[in-house]
């Protein structure tokens, strides 16, 4: 009871002057509040409150539910309290069966006692099951039993309050603990695709997946640098306790070029926030861009292989691809494949494999590709390098020696004279005339060169060598001369291949 100091308001006095009172069930509760400025009695138990404006609180036949705290308050707002236990052997506990706890916080199992003199007031698991080993609790007969630092693992734990009354263990109604998880990490967010490429009028739809321990995670789609509220749809699932997944789908039914930009899926919880972005590019129509992977002018040696390779971007996806040479379409020897297996891939590769090329197979090789919106092509000019071939070597009626050679690149013809029987011709002879015969002919064939020298310059027996050469190789032809008197005779010419 309060002590009184004169001159300042004092709290009311209660009769009986005790802090606690034990009443048997069925007996009377009579409490008197003594204060000249009496205002009210209030009764509290399990969050229920009753009021009484009489200064005497009388309950004629006390029940277990009358157990609780009785408080008298005066006009100065000062109060005094007495706690009354109504001992009922048939109802040892008052219970509020709702039991919620927040992870890492304490929670109260509301099972106050109606008899403070019982022993072993504690918690027990349902159906004789033991409580979790790490579960700690603190009993308070007037309030209930506090579970300390609730763990996630206690979710849906079934338990009873328990006490020993006259040597027997008594259990309360069961409680099911529901644990609200603490957010201990930011939400996990991911997006269905990192980038989207669409044509005007097509539908844009992107899904953000948010994972967290509770459905109380906030999420939204935002357009970067814009406050406009976007329309989104949600689907959600609980894959077990504390394993929640939400799919937030953003849709623009008919995308426009000015819808292009970066869209952010943002999520946050009480721990922090996370986001992921996707990029939308809307084009007014489709496109194809071709990038040669080798020079479009190709030089290859006779008999060797070459691969003509292009990469190309195509949107929408390519529908027709072909390689063409001399108005003929290749049915094989080429392959076309996506650069990556990524769903948003728009880059492709096409390769034409030309094997053991002949000199006659030079020319323009064209790659053509089309989609539903556009066509595109690229041409490769292929030149086949061939060693020179001497086509003719003759002594003309006018006394000229003429040598005609073909090859690519354009052969050079040199003349040499070998006196007598020497095998090595070293003295070079300047030609009288050199002509490129097909300079205006087909651009990719062999180039034909004609060179002539005046045989009258030779005064001795010997051999004249016509040597045609280029970057690939060389070939020679020989004219043998023998003098009989004053007559010069050409013995049969012959060629000698010099690789």
């Amino acid at each position: 009871q309060p002590s009184v100091s004169p001159g300042e308001p004092s709290p009311p006095s209660i009769h009986p002057a005790k802090s606690e009172l034990i009443v048997r069930v069925g007996n009377e509760i009579r409490l008197l509040c003594i204060d000249p400025g009496f205002v009210k009695w209030t009764f509290e138990i399990l969050d229920e409150t009753n009021e009484n404006k009489q200064n005497e609180w009388i309950t004629e036949k006390a029940e277990a539910t009358n157990t609780g705290k009785y408080t008298c308050t005066n006009k100065h707002g000062l109060s005094s309290s007495i706690y009354v236990f109504v001992r009922d052997p048939a109802k040892l506990f008052l219970v509020d069966r709702s039991l919620y706890g927040k992870e890492d916080n304490d929670t109260l199992v509301r099972c106050p006692l109606t008899d403070p003199e019982v022993t072993s007031y504690s918690l027990k698991g349902c159906q004789g099951k033991p409580l979790p080993k790490d579960l700690r609790f603190v009993p308070d007969p007037k309030a209930g039993i506090t579970i300390k630092s609730v763990k996630r693992a206690y979710h849906r734990l079934c338990l009873h309050c328990s006490a020993d009354q006259e040597g027997k263990s008594v259990l309360s109604d069961k409680f099911i603990l529901k644990v609200r998880p603490a957010f201990k990490a930011v939400p996990v967010v991911s997006v269905s695709k990192a980038s989207y490429l669409l044509r005007e009028g097509e539908e844009f739809t992107v899904t953000c997946t948010i994972k967290d321990v509770s459905s109380s995670v906030y999420s939204t789609w935002k357009r970067e640098n814009s406050q406009t509220k976007l329309q989104e749809k949600y689907n959600s699932w609980h894959h077990g306790d504390f394993n929640y997944e939400r799919q937030a789908t953003l849709t623009i039914s008919s995308a426009r070029v000015n819808d292009s930009g970066v869209f952010m899926c943002y999520a946050n919880n009480t721990f922090g926030s996370a986001n992921v972005t996707t990029t939308l590019e809307v084009v007014d129509k489709g496109f194809i861009n071709i990038f040669p992977m080798i020079n479009t002018t190709v030089f290859v040696n006779d008999g060797e292989n070459v691969d003509l390779i292009v990469e190309y971007e195509a949107f929408p996806k390519p529908e027709h691809q072909q390689w063409i040479y001399m108005n003929r379409t290749f049915t094989d020897k080429w392959e076309d494949y996506p650069k990556s297996e990524n769903e948003s891939n728009i880059r492709y590769v096409s390769e034409l494999h030309l094997t053991r090329l002949k000199g006659t197979e030079g020319g323009t090789y064209t790659f053509l590709v089309s989609n539903s919106d556009v066509n595109a092509s690229i041409a490769f000019n292929v030149y086949v390098n061939t060693k020179p071939e001497i086509l003719t070597y003759d002594r003309l009626v006018n006394g000229m020696l003429q040598c005609v050679a073909a090859g690519f690149p354009e052969p050079t013809i040199d003349w040499y004279f070998c006196p007598g029987t020497e095998q090595r011709c070293s003295a070079s002879v300047l030609p009288v005339d050199v002509q490129t015969l097909n300079a205006s002919g087909p651009p990719f064939g062999k180039l034909v060169v004609q060179s002539s020298i005046d045989s009258s310059a030779f005064k001795h027996n010997g051999t004249v060598e016509c040597k045609a050469y280029n970057d690939v190789g060389k070939t020679s032809a020989y004219f043998n001369f023998a003098f009989k008197g004053n007559n010069k005779e050409q013995i049969h010419p012959h060629t000698l291949f010099t690789p």
């Epitope: 509020d96 919620y100 927040k102 609200r180 689907n235 959600s236 306790d241 929640y244």
Partner: antibody
């Protein structure tokens, strides 16, 4: 024992909004899930959405997304459900119930609030 | 959304009868299924949670079973106060209820 006490019946015109309250007496209101479930005359039950006041984030059924707003005031242990753009088919009894989020069952129900939408 | 299909939609039974109501989910909901009883003009009342756990204060004649997609509510011996409408409800995705089963007096 905890009780959920709902506000009284409402008659509304089509196109208008209604805000229904639900006060929880006692208990740990802030970590309850409070949901709203409606029942049209002679029909079944339909979940509209819910909130855990401690987290402050409401979840809504797809059908009501953008038309319903659920809030909670921890200081008064009261949850609110506001439904906008009312139409005649929104005439129903609106219940608040404890549970309905994070796999909680509805273990406690208010008595319901009849909302009539009529021109 | 997950669809919940209850059958039958109504049934007539007598006091003392054993009554079985089934609920089928359109996809697996593990054991996140609850059963409610509703009487005319009243709010629903929770009977069974987590498919088979009896809510405190509910008579033991009510029982629930099943997991995945198929669930059953059984009333072992129907009492006069059991004539009502019964609803199942899933809690895995956006909450949905079954269409209800009305239990009437034969």
């Amino acid at each position: 024992q905890v009780q959920l006490v709902q506000s009284g019946a409402e008659v509304k015109k089509p196109g208008s909004s209604v805000k229904v309250s639900c006060k929880a007496s006692g208990g740990t209101f802030r970590i309850y899930a409070i949901s709203w479930v409606r029942q049209a005359p002679g029909q079944g039950l339909e979940w509209m959405g819910g909130i855990i006041p401690d987290f402050g984030v409401a979840n809504y059924a797809q059908k009501f997304q953008g038309r319903v707003t659920i809030t909670a005031d921890e200081s008064t242990s009261t949850a609110y459900m506001e439904l906008s753009s009312l139409r005649s088919e929104d005439t129903a009894v609106y219940y608040c119930a404890r549970g309905g989020l994070d796999t909680d069952e509805f273990d406690l129900w208010g008595r319901g609030t009849l909302v009539t939408v009529s021109s | 959304d997950i669809q919940m299909t209850q059958s039958p939609s109504s049934l007539s039974a007598s006091v003392g009868d054993r009554v079985t109501i089934t609920c089928r989910a359109s996809q697996s909901i593990n054991s996140y299924l609850n059963w409610y009883q509703q009487k005319p003009g009243k709010a629903p009342k929770l009977l069974i949670y987590a498919a088979s756990s009896l809510q405190s204060g509910v008579p033991s004649r009510f029982s629930g079973s099943g997991s995945g997609t198929d669930f059953t509510l059984t009333i072992s011996s129907l009492q006069p106060e059991d004539f009502a409408t019964y609803y199942c409800q899933q809690g895995v995705s956006d909450i949905t209820f079954g269409g209800g089963t009305k239990v009437e007096i034969k």
